[in-house]
């Protein structure tokens, strides 16, 4: 089973209003069942939202970054913090909310074409002296913005779903985010029982495709709550 996720190695499905309604395209991803932060409450609500410990920005949600909760606080104690909106102060790109990046210490809109080249190092994995490429990772010293007009194919590294081609979403896979296929009819999905639930996992699934919703598979109605299988079904 995948209940072996330990020590803040997984992304969260953020509760509304931070991440859209769970299981809806607004949230981009659907948590794999049973993959939870140890000791966490599978059905937490936003009211008792627990700080999520982290070591790297990549371990936080797309609308979060990893930092000490207090200015000048203990660097050893870091949690996922809400991203900074436009015109807020920042120290790195990950601090700024999707659609923005950090320029001269301020979060600014990333509409400009030159933005992507500036954050190349944050989304590609350096190979040192190894010039091979593997699954969308590549070593580059420069990165033309043109690359980002071409949407990522399945397996390409991404920051968010808008980086991916049609029919794909940006989802966590181990400790990277890559473009994965939006779920089709009959495919296994994850339905959170409450909008505020936190599924913490490193194998995220996309949401169900258009015209589909994540529902209990008919022949699983009699099964126990924990083993209920959800699949993408026609509305």
């Amino acid at each position: 089973t995948l209940n072996s996720v330990l020590n803040s190695n997984a992304i969260k499905n953020l509760p509304p209003p931070l991440g859209g309604a769970a299981g809806h395209p607004g949230s981009a991803v659907s948590a794999a069942p049973g993959i939870l932060y140890p000791g966490g409450n599978k059905y937490q609500t936003i009211d008792n939202y627990q700080p999520y410990p982290c070591a790297e920005d990549e371990e936080c949600g797309t609308d979060e970054y990893c930092a000490s909760p207090t200015r000048g606080g203990d660097a050893g104690v870091q949690i996922c913090l809400a991203c900074r909106k436009r015109r807020k102060r920042c120290m790195r790109h990950a601090m700024c909310c999707p659609g923005n990046y950090c320029k001269n210490g301020i979060c600014v809109s990333s509409d400009q074409n030159h933005f992507r080249g500036e954050i190349e190092e944050t989304i590609t994995e350096s190979f040192g002296n190894d010039h091979s490429t593997l699954d969308g990772y590549s070593r580059r010293t420069t990165l033309s913005s043109k690359m980002y007009h071409t949407k990522g194919q399945e397996g390409s590294v991404c920051l968010r779903s808008s980086d991916c081609a049609s029919g794909l979403c940006c989802a966590r896979h181990f400790w990277s985010k890559i473009c994965k296929p939006v779920l089709k009819e009959g495919q296994v999905c994850t339905k959170h029982r409450r909008k505020g639930s936190h599924g913490l996992e490193i194998f995220q699934r996309c949401y169900c495709g258009e015209g589909l919703s994540c529902r209990i598979q008919k022949d699983h109605h009699q099964a126990s709550n924990s083993s209920r299988l959800h699949t993408c079904q026609r509305h």
Epitope: N9, A55, E56, E125, Y137, W175, S176, P181
Partner: antibody, heavy 119, light 106 residues
Framework: EVQLLESGGGLVQPGGSLRLSCAAS????????MSWVRQAPGKGLEWVSA????????YYADSVKGRFTISRDNSKNTLYLQMNSLRAEDTAVYYC????????????WGQGTLVTVSS | DIQMTQSPSSLSASVGDRVTITCRAS??????LHWYQQKPGKAPKLLIY???TLHSGVPSRFSGSGSGTDFTLTISSLQPEDFATYYC????????FGGGTKVEIK
């Protein structure tokens, strides 16, 4: 040259402990997720554990959960596997591997170090 | 966990033969499937990742195909250095390897 070099294997009694090390060179270790994969004598490959690039995320196979601990020291370009409460079935060659990368492949492997658990 | 079943478990072939090894997943794994070659006493080597992409430095006689549950590794013309054991590995959900296919000299 991209290289991984394991060390620390040997003979240990059941219930004993051992710490494996993997020295990395030729690539940017601090940006790479790393794993341990083992192979029992005459058997197939079994993935054991993985750790994220910064060390904040760790992940284990059910067979070793609670007994093994993966860690890394990016300043030393070294990966570790602390193995406690060893059992006879843990006897294997332990490989250090770079990955999972991208969709989850392991693209660089060490030569392996043999761990024998026997009384 | 997702089970990976390789077939055959072993095969005998001659230099120049076309060799096909199959790998079947217990559930759909999209293209999160990778192939490795291992020679006795040596570490595995990545041949193909993401079902069909040839890893750098791997000869073009190796190819991979498939998606979902059924995958194939093909060696178009077997060379003396290709006699080895081949493993598939899925990473769609956790990480599991197939049991291996030993390619021996006929």
């Amino acid at each position: 040259e991209v290289q991984l070099l394991e060390s620390g294997g040997g003979l240990v009694q059941p219930g004993g402990s051992l710490r494996l090390s993997c020295a990395a060179s030729g690539f940017t270790f601090r940006t790479s997720a790393m794993s341990w994969v083992r192979q029992a004598p005459g058997k197939g490959l079994e993935w054991v554990s993985a750790i994220s690039s910064g060390g904040g995320g760790t992940y284990y196979a059910d067979s070793v959960k609670g007994r093994f601990t993966i860690s890394r020291d990016n300043s030393k370009n070294t990966l570790y596997l602390q193995m406690n409460s060893l059992r006879a079935e843990d006897t294997a060659v332990y490989y250090c591997a770079r990955g999972p990368r991208g969709r989850g492949a392991f693209d660089v492997w060490g030569q392996g170090t043999l761990v024998t658990v026997s009384s | 966990d997702i089970q990976m079943t390789q077939s055959p478990s072993s095969l005998s072939a001659s230099v120049g033969d076309r060799v096909t090894i199959t790998c079947r997943a217990s559930q759909s794994i999209s293209t999160y499937l990778h192939w490795y070659q291992q020679k006795p006493g040596k570490a595995p080597k990545l041949l193909i990742y993401a079902a069909s992409t040839l890893h750098s430095g791997v000869p073009s006689r190796f190819s991979g195909s498939g998606s979902g549950t059924d995958f194939t590794l093909t060696i178009s013309s077997l060379q003396p250095e290709d006699f080895a054991t081949y493993y598939c590995q899925q990473s769609y959900n956790s990480i599991t390897f197939g049991g291996g296919t030993k390619v021996e000299i006929k």
